[in-house]
């Protein structure tokens, strides 16, 4: 059957932990992505940012997992109003910020 939302979120959190701890070299060669507002709709916004990073196998699973939280199809070059379009940060910092926010959402029971 379908994975419960709480399990899916926990698995996403654990995948982000794996990414942050396994990096010897800069994550995705130090690629920069648009920062996002960590509010409603931020799963799609996070995917929109990360999908523009190509050739980085370390985040491919994260991209797939985020697509499960986003109700619409996301493609490269697509941007929502949730992006802070004047601020780019390294993928590693993006992942750390997203991870901390998701842990707080999990605590609050916001699984979707």
């Amino acid at each position: 059957g379908p994975v419960p939302p709480s399990t899916a979120l926990r698995e996403l959190i654990e995948e982000l932990v794996n990414i942050t701890q396994n990096q010897k070299a800069p994550l995705c060669n130090g690629s920069m992505v648009w920062s996002i507002n960590l509010t409603a709709g931020m799963y799609c916004a996070a995917l929109e940012s990360l999908i523009n990073v190509s050739g980085c196998s370390a985040i491919e699973k994260t991209q797939r997992m985020l697509s499960g939280f986003c109700p619409h199809k996301v493609s490269a070059g697509q941007f929502s109003s949730l992006h802070v379009r004047d601020t780019k940060i390294e993928v590693a910092q993006f992942v750390k910020d997203l991870l901390l926010h998701l842990k707080k959402l999990f605590r609050e029971g916001q699984f979707n």
Partner: antibody
Framework: QMQLVESGGGVVQPGRSLTLSCAAS????????MHWVRQAPGKGLEWVGV????????HYADSVKGRFTITRDNSKNTLNLQMNSLRAEDTAVYYC???????????????WGQGTMVTVSS | SYILTQPPSVSVAPGETATITCGGN??????VHWYQQKPGQAPVLVIY???DRPSRIPERFSGSNIGNTATLTISDVEAGDEADYYC???????????FGGGTKLTVL
């Protein structure tokens, strides 16, 4: 100011019962999850249990499950810990502590009482 | 049940930086809180949610949490920082709160 004050500690024989109380003041007691944490002499902190802000749920450490019961009276701003079938290993300073209530209560304990000593000895 | 591992003791000279670690399986997936306890006193929250600091706690205290290790860092250590420090998490699987064994910080 915000305060938690425990009372009811003392010396009790193994197998007997004891009830600890915690009086809260200076904050909106009914909006906080409330915990008991204990510390055996010379040892580290051990979580005992929690009661949700509205008293609707309790959770306990395995070491006290079935023996200890946490209750609260939001009209009187009081928290209680009923301890039955006490054992020597229950000897400790018992602290009450508050934590903002979330859905899954994974919060920090941001206010602690001064503690009350419980000694279980024959 | 979930286990948190801390070094029993850490020693540091005044003015130096103290680093206290808290190890646990995928602890990075959990929100970690840190408490300071001085002899004969109740614990005091010094870091919550991995890296946030209560308003009354000096900026010298900071926290991080990556992978299997959470870290409490105290920079420019003072004699008054001498205390026991405990990390703590909530374990989703057992629905219980877990403390590390504690680390005694000695200021030389």
């Amino acid at each position: 100011q915000m305060q938690l004050v425990e009372s009811g500690g003392g010396v009790v024989q193994p197998g007997r019962s004891l009830t600890l109380s915690c009086a809260a003041s200076g904050f909106e007691f009914r909006t906080y999850g409330m915990h008991w944490v204990r510390q055996a002499p010379g040892k580290g902190l051990e979580w005992v249990g929690v009661i949700w802000y509205d008293g609707s749920a309790t959770h306990y450490a395995d070491s006290v499950k079935g023996r200890f019961t946490i209750t609260r009276d939001n009209s009187k701003n009081t928290l209680n810990l009923q301890m039955n079938s006490l054992r020597a290993e229950d000897t400790a300073v018992y602290y009450c502590a508050r934590a903002p209530q979330w859905y899954l209560t994974a919060e920090a304990f941001d206010l602690w009482g001064q503690g009350t000593m419980v000694t279980v000895s024959s | 049940s979930y286990i948190l591992t801390q070094p029993p003791s850490v020693s540091v000279a005044p003015g130096e930086t103290a680093t206290i670690t808290c190890g646990g399986n995928l602890i990075g997936a959990k929100l970690v809180h840190w408490y300071q306890q001085k002899p004969g006193q109740a614990p005091v929250l010094v870091i919550y949610d991995d890296s946030d600091r209560p308003s009354r706690i000096p900026e010298r205290f900071s926290g991080s949490n990556i992978g299997n290790t959470a870290t409490l860092t105290i920079s420019d250590v003072e004699a008054g920082d001498e205390a026991d420090y405990y990390c703590q998490v909530w374990d989703y699987y057992s629905d219980t709160y877990v403390f590390g064994g504690g680390t005694k910080l000695t200021v030389l």
